[in-house]
């Protein structure tokens, strides 16, 4: 979020000042708030970063991560006869990123037009509200993937109906969960009207006030319980996850399963470093540099780790590739342009004239799609 | 001390072109945001345009639009205005100030001393 | 564009006099509001910024007030020095427009 110093330097960053005084109108006093906005802060909005650079990472995020995640949620949700806990959590983490994407045209617009916003306030919220709630949604909901990848190794079970509802009261938990801790975000009025420019910002400017004290204690608290806690139980989940797979035997089809396993890890591991630490991190670090010294220096960081938290859009279709044997079918045959009916009917023919040449049967598991859970 | 020492004024005649120069001294000049106003004869005050301190930006009146060009060189420390398409309107004296962008907004806090530009045939 | 309208045209004040000059917007303004003082010959010179704030090296008996479009500026215990014409600006919406001037002499 930028804000403006009241020192006209170059290289600092951005604190909104906020004048506290009050003006006496007809209808009583009122106390009007004001965002400062200095040469530092103005060239930050008017600058490359913010208008070129931004718009161009969410270009690809939206192309890259619209269609993926809208395959994603209809596979599962009309393609997968079996709906494992598995299913219903990336179900959820593609309905997330949906929800999130869907709004990055205008986001996109935004920052193309020189960080001037023309939809309203209400759009504004809704946008930042689902930014945000989208990167903690995507982080509980990995969690729960995470934990629940080791939990069938471990417990190697077949398909209950009481897990899957389980697995949706959890699901409906993390929603309910992260619209009551986005609700700040929709109630704190974010655009802002900038005269010097000529633009209202949409969150790019807040008033101190606020900022200071308010926004770094919420965003801490976000990053402890909503970033620190998910990942250490992720990162549980897969050291010991590494460790069953290691000391398991090892056949071509638990070898295959290993491979996929591993693959999952450093995709989830990546999305991590890439998305959610740097951009928890910096808005914790960015806020107390606020709220400490009056002014951030990492603000291109921040902006820029914030830009690169909406990549978990593009990474999540990777974990569901790794985890779902549907979605890989479907996957595989969008990229070929071919649907997977046909390679079914494929499947079938191939099998019945192996049949008609052999007298010895074969299993027709080849014309069912199987899940890998 | 902040120093702004505008050049350039003079008779030109209507449909003719003027550049201006400011030359900024006492400050670091690629960090302000800068324009310049005119005060025609007798008359109150009328801003003619703004640059951002990146250069990026540059803002005028409907008045100038087309005809003015906001221009700086950070090298030089210099502001200019190149004013084309001249008519009688725009005799005036023209002042080059630094400005303080606070509070979202231009605040014009330090001025130049003027030149005169008489447009007449 | 934003019409800014002062009034009185011109005023006389005695010596340490309070006097007050009025700017009008012709839509509210948010309180991006200026006053320039400028004395004859001179360059104008910022006295008040955002409607109250007083500009450094500016005496303390200048002060700004009001809010919308209603601003003023008020000048207590006039003194010699205070003469000249006062402009009031607009910084809220390009293009930024100024007062006619308000002319302030001493009695």
């Known amino acids: 979020t930028i804000q403006g110093t009241n020192r006209s330097s170059k290289g600092r960053s951005l604190i909104g000042k906020v004048d506290g005084t009050s003006h006496v109108t007809g209808k009583g006093v009122t106390v009007e708030t004001v965002f400062s906005v200095d040469e530092f802060s103005a060239s930050v909005l008017t600058g490359k970063l913010t208008t070129v650079f931004l718009p161009i990472v969410y270009t690809i995020v939206f192309v890259v991560g619209l269609p993926s995640n809208g395959m994603a949620l209809w596979v599962f949700l009309f393609r997968t006869k079996k709906k494992h806990p598995a299913v219903i959590y990336m179900a959820n983490l593609a309905l997330a990123d949906l929800l999130s994407v869907i709004w990055f045209p205008l986001k996109i617009a935004y920052h193309i037009h020189g960080n001037n916003w023309i939809y309203g306030e209400a759009l504004c919220n809704v946008l930042i509200g689902f930014f945000y709630g989208n990167m903690y949604c995507s982080i509980l909901f990995m969690t729960c993937l995470s934990v629940q990848r080791y939990w069938v190794i471990v417990n190697p079970m077949g398909h209950s109906r009481k897990k899957a509802n389980i697995a949706i009261g959890i699901s409906l938990a993390i929603w309910l969960l992260i619209l009551l801790v986005t609700i700040p975000l929709y109630v704190v009025k974010q655009t802002i009207f900038i005269p010097a420019l000529n633009i209202t910002t949409c969150h790019d400017v807040l008033p101190e006030q606020l900022l200071v004290g308010d926004m770094f204690n919420y965003f801490l608290s976000l990053a402890i319980g909503v970033f620190l806690f998910p990942a250490f139980l992720t990162a549980s989940a897969y050291v010991l996850m590494i460790r069953m797979l290691r000391s398991s035997a090892m056949d071509e089809n638990s070898e295959k399963k290993r491979k996929r396993a591993i693959k999952l890890i450093v995709t989830v591991l990546a999305m991590y470093l890439i998305c959610f630490t740097p951009s928890n991190l910096l808005l914790v670090v960015h806020y107390f540099l606020i709220k400490s010294q009056g002014q951030s220096h990492v603000y291109a960081l921040y902006i820029v780790a914030l830009c690169l938290s909406t990549l978990n859009s593009c990474i999540d279709p990777f974990v569901y590739y790794f985890v779902s044997h549907d979605f890989r079918d479907h996957a595989k045959n969008a990229l070929l342009c071919r649907s997977v009916r046909t390679v079914k009917q494929m499947q079938v023919s191939l099998t019945s004239k192996k049949h008609s040449r052999k007298s010895s049967s074969y299993s027709s598991s080849s014309t069912t799609v199987k899940t890998s859970y | 001390e902040v120093q702004l020492v505008e050049s350039g004024g003079g008779l030109v005649q209507p449909g003719r072109s003027l550049k201006l120069s400011c030359v900024a001294t006492?400050?670091?000049?690629?960090?302000?945001?800068m324009t310049w106003i005119r005060q025609a004869p007798g008359k109150g005050l009328e801003w003619v345009a703004s640059?951002?301190?990146?250069?990026?930006?540059?803002y005028y009146p409907d008045s100038v639009k087309g005809r003015f060009t906001i221009s700086r060189d950070d090298a030089k420390s210099t502001l200019y205005l190149q004013m084309n398409s001249l008519r009688s309107e725009d005799t005036a004296t023209y002042y080059c100030?630094?400005?303080?962008?606070?509070?979202?907004?231009?605040?014009?806090?330090?001025w130049g001393q003027g030149t005169l530009v008489t447009v007449s045939s | 564009d934003i019409q800014m309208t002062q009034s009185p045209h011109s005023l006389s004040a005695s010596l340490g006099e309070t006097v007050s000059i009025e700017c009008l917007a012709s839509?509210?303004?948010?309180?991006?509001l200026a006053w320039f003082q400028q004395k004859p010959g001179k360059s104008p010179q910022l006295l008040i910024y955002y409607a109250s704030s007083l500009q450094d090296g500016v005496p303390s008996r200048f002060s700004g007030s009001g809010s919308g479009t209603q601003y003023s500026l008020k000048i207590s215990n006039m003194q010699p020095e205070d003469e000249g014409v006062y402009y009031c600006q607009q910084g809220y919406k390009y293009p930024w427009t100024f007062g006619g001037g308000t002319k302030l002499e001493l009695k």
């Open positions: 006492g400050f670091t000049f690629n960090n302000y945001w």
């Open positions: 100030t630094r400005v303080r962008v606070y509070y979202g907004s231009n605040w014009f806090v330090y």
């Open positions: 839509e509210g303004i948010s309180n991006y």
């Open positions: 640059i951002t301190n990146s250069g990026g930006n540059t």
